[in-house]
C-alpha cells in the first residue's frame, strides 16, 4: 500500500507511517514502528503536558514564589499546570500571574466600586452628590450623607464628597 501523506486526529506522520500521539500527561520516548505502538511515558512529579503531543520533555509546573506574594490556588497535575494566585491583600500584575502588587486603596472622596480579588485590583469611583468617603480604604464604599430630617434635625454644614453633613437642632421660632 501507498505510504500515507496525512494522518488521523491524534496521530502524526513519521518515517512514512502514522503513529499515535501521546495522551496528555505523557511524553514521547520512541516513535511507533511496524511492530510496536508509539512509546509514551508519564510526566514526572511537578511536570505536565496538557495536549495530545509528541514532546520528548514534559513542562515544569509553575512555581508560585511566596517572595513575590504568590501562593498555589490549584495544584498542577500531570495534565495541568499549577495555577497561582496572590496572598490576601495583593493581586496579580498580569493574566499569567507571575508577581503580585498590593491592592490599591481608594482615597477620601472615592469609594470602592469593586473589591480587589487575587487577579484584579480595587476599582474606585468618585463619590457622587449625596455620598462621601473620608478614609483611604480598599474596602469602604461611598456612604450616603446623614439624613438630618429623619432625625428631626437640620443641616448645619453641607456635606462634600469627603465629609458627611453636620446636623444641628432646628431654630425655635421667636415670639
Amino acid at each position: 500500500p501507498e505510504p500515507p501523506t496525512a494522518c488521523r486526529e491524534k496521530q502524526y506522520l513519521i518515517n512514512s507511517q502514522c503513529c499515535s500521539l501521546c495522551q496528555p500527561g505523557q511524553k514521547l520516548v520512541s516513535d511507533c514502528t511496524e511492530f510496536t505502538e508509539t512509546e509514551c511515558l508519564p510526566c514526572g512529579e511537578s511536570e505536565f503536558l496538557d495536549t495530545w503531543n509528541r514532546e520528548t520533555h514534559c513542562h515544569q509546573h509553575k512555581y508560585c514564589d511566596p517572595n513575590l506574594g504568590l501562593r498555589v490556588q490549584q495544584k498542577g497535575t500531570s495534565e495541568t499546570d499549577t495555577i497561582c494566585t496572590c496572598e490576601e491583600g495583593w493581586h496579580c500584575t498580569s493574566e499569567a500571574c507571575e508577581s503580585c502588587v498590593l491592592h490599591r486603596s481608594c482615597s477620601p472622596g472615592f469609594g470602592v466600586k469593586q473589591i480587589a480579588t487575587g487577579v484584579s485590583d480595587t476599582i474606585c469611583e468618585p463619590c457622587p452628590v449625596g455620598f462621601f468617603s473620608n478614609v483611604s480604604s480598599a474596602f469602604e464604599k461611598c456612604h450616603p450623607w446623614t439624613s438630618c430630617e429623619t432625625k428631626d434635625l437640620v443641616v448645619q454644614q453641607a456635606g462634600t464628597n469627603k465629609t458627611d453633613v453636620v446636623c444641628g437642632p432646628q431654630d425655635r421660632l421667636r415670639a
Partner: antibody, heavy 115, light 110 residues
Amino acid sequence: QVQLVQSGAEVKKPGSSVKVSCKASGGTFSSYAISWVRQAPGQGLEWMGMINPSGGTTSYAQKFQGRVTMTRDTSTSTVYMELSSLRPEDTAVYYCARGFRMDQWGQGTLVTVSS
Amino acid sequence: QSALTQPPSASGSPGQSVTISCTGTSSDVGAYNFVSWYQQHPGNAPKLIIYDVRKRPSGIPDRFSASKSGNTASLTVSGLQADDEADYYCSSYAGNNRLVFGGGTKLTVL
C-alpha cells in the same frame, strides 16, 4: 525498521575506562531514546540508563551514577556509553536497545575487565 | 538483588501452559502500566515479547499473553513448544526516567 549495531569486544584493565558505541540505522535517529543494559556471565539483565531522543538528556541508574556517561553524535546516528573506574565485576555483555520498552536490541558488546 | 522478583525456574510439558510471575512494588509494577517481558535464548540478545502489560509486538504468537494485578505482573505461555525454552525477564518503568528488571526465569520444556 530500526537496526542497532554495536562496537566489538574489549578487554580492559581494572581502573581504566571503556567506551561502547551503538550505531542506529532506519527510522529517525532523534525520535527514539536509547537504553543501555548489561548482563554479567550467567546473570540477569541490569538497566544502566538511557539517553533522551532529543537534546541528549540522560538518566542513569543510581548504581552507575558518577561512573557512566552516555552521549550521542547525531551526525553519525551513534550513541556511546562510557564506563569508568572499571572493576572485574563489570565484566559483562553490554547492550543498547531502543526506548524504555526496548523493542530493538543491538547484538551486544562483551567487555572483559581483567588484570 | 533485582528490583522485581521472578521465580528462578518454571517448567511444563509440550502443549501445556506455564505462568511466570513478576512481583514489584506500588512504585513500579503497581504504579504504571509499563511492564514488558523479554525472551532470551542462550548467546542471543533479549527479544521483546510483551509491552505495556499485555500488548504483543506484531509477529509474536498469541500463545504469549500477559496481565497485571496490583503489584504483580504475569506472563503465560500456552501450547508450550520446544523453542519456548529460554530465559524470560520482566521489566517495569519505575518513574523519574528509571527502569527496573526482574531477576529472570529459566523456562524448561520437559
